[in-house]
């Protein structure tokens, strides 16, 4: 565990062991301040050559419990003539991102690290020709 | 919370206090299976009219402790004959994902949730022209 | 404290469109999805869908959709309602309210004063 | 669309008197939520989860249920508790609320 620092205030504590059950305080910490709002515009899903949907993703029992998903609009990319080209396709950025999933008919509440895939937003790529042999 | 089950089970526990002191076991479960690899082709930052290179964010105190992040190549897009066109801008995707970051000096080792924006890839959107007044 | 500042009642006419606003204050606006609630004497509360800030997504109830469009301006913190081609059914008062993201568990939990929408010719 | 009803639609009670309403819902969810509202302002969340009561909220209410059926109880009515209780569930779009409870001191 990368996690556990180099200095390690805690030499008795054995990684594998602190792995399994550590202490988490859930309230958000918010590092990024005022820099979200002006360095994140939400209009790219509409104006760029490969638009997407977001769709809500609601799980009670996972921390965040909400989850703006991605989908691409269409299967190809939008022209500067506002028409679907056919030579490019749109596509999906997915990011593996770490979710806390409470664990069934825990007491106290305990929860479990989880990888999730989600899509962030499309971008335009050039159709791939597949040769005859 | 949410993750606090229908029944309860836990009834004397606030929820307010419940959010600051939570147990996590940090063993990735993969919920994703072999799917991640299949799903994810990792050459589109190479394909996209917009692309983008990866860069390594390395902390030691957060859990990951390795985090990829997305830079785009070009401050335009890259057209068909692979030259850069000056009417289509290359915008990072980024997407706030949460992190757990080890309170200093914490034993035994505790952590704080922590949003952080992260550069997932590119996309390409028509430049905005400022009308002159 | 936590305030959702509605903008004023409007009397408009049949067929216009309005726009409301609800300004946010005393948390960050992008930690909350903005969703907002119509009620009637005739209908009670009907949720008419979602806004998250943070990402731009928009979510409706089927009922409304076509009807309301919802943004959101992080930069002011100020969420928006567009109503359109309005009936008198569209007559009502019309709420803002917040949703946490991270733990939906709370619900919505703070609200705005309502807003007062009269559709009449 | 799952449909919340409420009973009684007009009740009253008296000062030191147990008040219980209840919630049906046509489809199971998974938790209930309480608004509070008096005439001419907004609702205010009352009991969440089913079981919290938001801040503020004196504890002679509680909520309870599972499954379909559902209460909000005051264990000794009070003349501030006089108002229309609306209940709400989120566990399937559309969100819907319930026709509301109003509740009278006699």
């Known amino acids: 565990a990368a996690i556990i620092p180099q200095s390690s205030a805690c030499p008795n504590t054995e990684a594998k062991d602190f792995l399994q059950n550590v202490k988490v305080n859930l309230k958000v910490f918010n590092s990024l301040g005022a820099k979200v709002s002006s360095r994140r515009p939400s209009d790219y899903l509409n104006r760029s050559t490969s638009p997407w949907t977001l769709h809500r993703n609601e799980d009670p029992d996972r921390y965040p419990s909400v989850i703006w998903e991605a989908q691409c609009r269409h299967q190809r990319c939008v022209n500067a003539e506002g028409k679907l080209d056919h030579h490019m396709n749109s596509v999906l950025i997915q990011q593996e991102i770490l979710v806390l999933k409470r664990e069934p008919e825990s007491c106290p509440f305990t929860f479990r690290v989880e990888k999730m895939l989600v899509g962030v937003g499309c971008t335009c790529v050039a159709s791939i020709v597949r040769q005859a042999a | 919370a949410a993750i606090i089950p229908q029944s309860s089970a836990c009834p004397n526990t606030e929820a307010k206090d419940f959010l600051q002191n939570v147990k996590v076991n940090l063993k990735v479960f993969n919920s994703l299976g072999a799917k991640v690899s299949s799903r994810r082709p990792s050459d589109y930052l190479n394909r996209s009219t917009s692309p983008w290179t990866l860069h390594r964010n390395e902390d030691p105190d957060r859990y990951p402790s390795v985090i990829w992040e997305a830079q785009c190549r070009h401050q335009r897009c890259v057209n068909a004959e692979g030259k850069l066109d000056h009417h289509m801008n290359s915008v990072l995707i980024q997407q706030e994902i949460l992190v757990l970051k080890r309170e200093p000096e914490s034993c035994p080792f505790t952590f704080r949730v922590e949003k952080m924006l992260v550069g997932v890839g590119c996309t390409c959107v028509a430049s905005i022209v400022r009308q002159a007044a | 404290q936590v305030q959702l500042q509605q903008s004023g009642a409007e009397l408009v006419r049949p067929g216009t469109s309005v726009t409301l606003s609800c300004k946010a204050s005393?948390?960050?606006?992008?930690?909350?999805?903005i969703h907002w609630v119509k009620q009637t004497p005739v209908h009670g509360l009907e949720w008419i869908g979602v806004n998250d800030p943070e990402s731009g997504g928009t979510f409706y109830n089927q009922k409304f959709d076509g009807k309301a469009e919802l943004t959101a301006d992080k930069s002011s913190s100020t969420a928006y309602m567009e109503l359109r081609s309005l009936t008198s059914e569209d007559s009502g008062v019309y709420y803002c309210?917040?949703?946490?993201?991270?733990?939906?568990?709370?619900?919505?939990?703070?609200w705005g004063q309502g807003t007062s929408i009269t559709v009449s010719s | 669309q799952i449909v919340l009803t409420q009973s009684p639609a007009i009740m009253s009670a008296s000062p030191g008197e147990k008040v219980t309403m209840t919630c049906s819902a046509s489809?199971?969810?998974?938790?209930i939520y309480w608004f509070q509202q008096k005439p001419g302002t907004s609702p205010k969340r009352w009991i969440y989860a089913t079981f919290e009561l938001a801040s503020g909220v004196p504890a002679r209410f509680s909520g309870s249920g599972s499954g379909t059926s559902y209460s909000l109880t005051i264990s000794s009515m009070e003349a501030e508790d006089a108002a229309t209780y609306y209940c709400h569930q989120r566990s399937s779009y559309p969100w819907t609320f319930g026709g509301g409870s109003k509740l009278e001191i006699k």
């Open positions: 005393g948390y960050i606006f992008t930690d909350y999805e």
């Open positions: 309210t917040r949703y946490y993201r991270y733990e939906s568990f709370y619900g919505m939990d703070y």
């Open positions: 489809s199971s969810i998974s938790y």
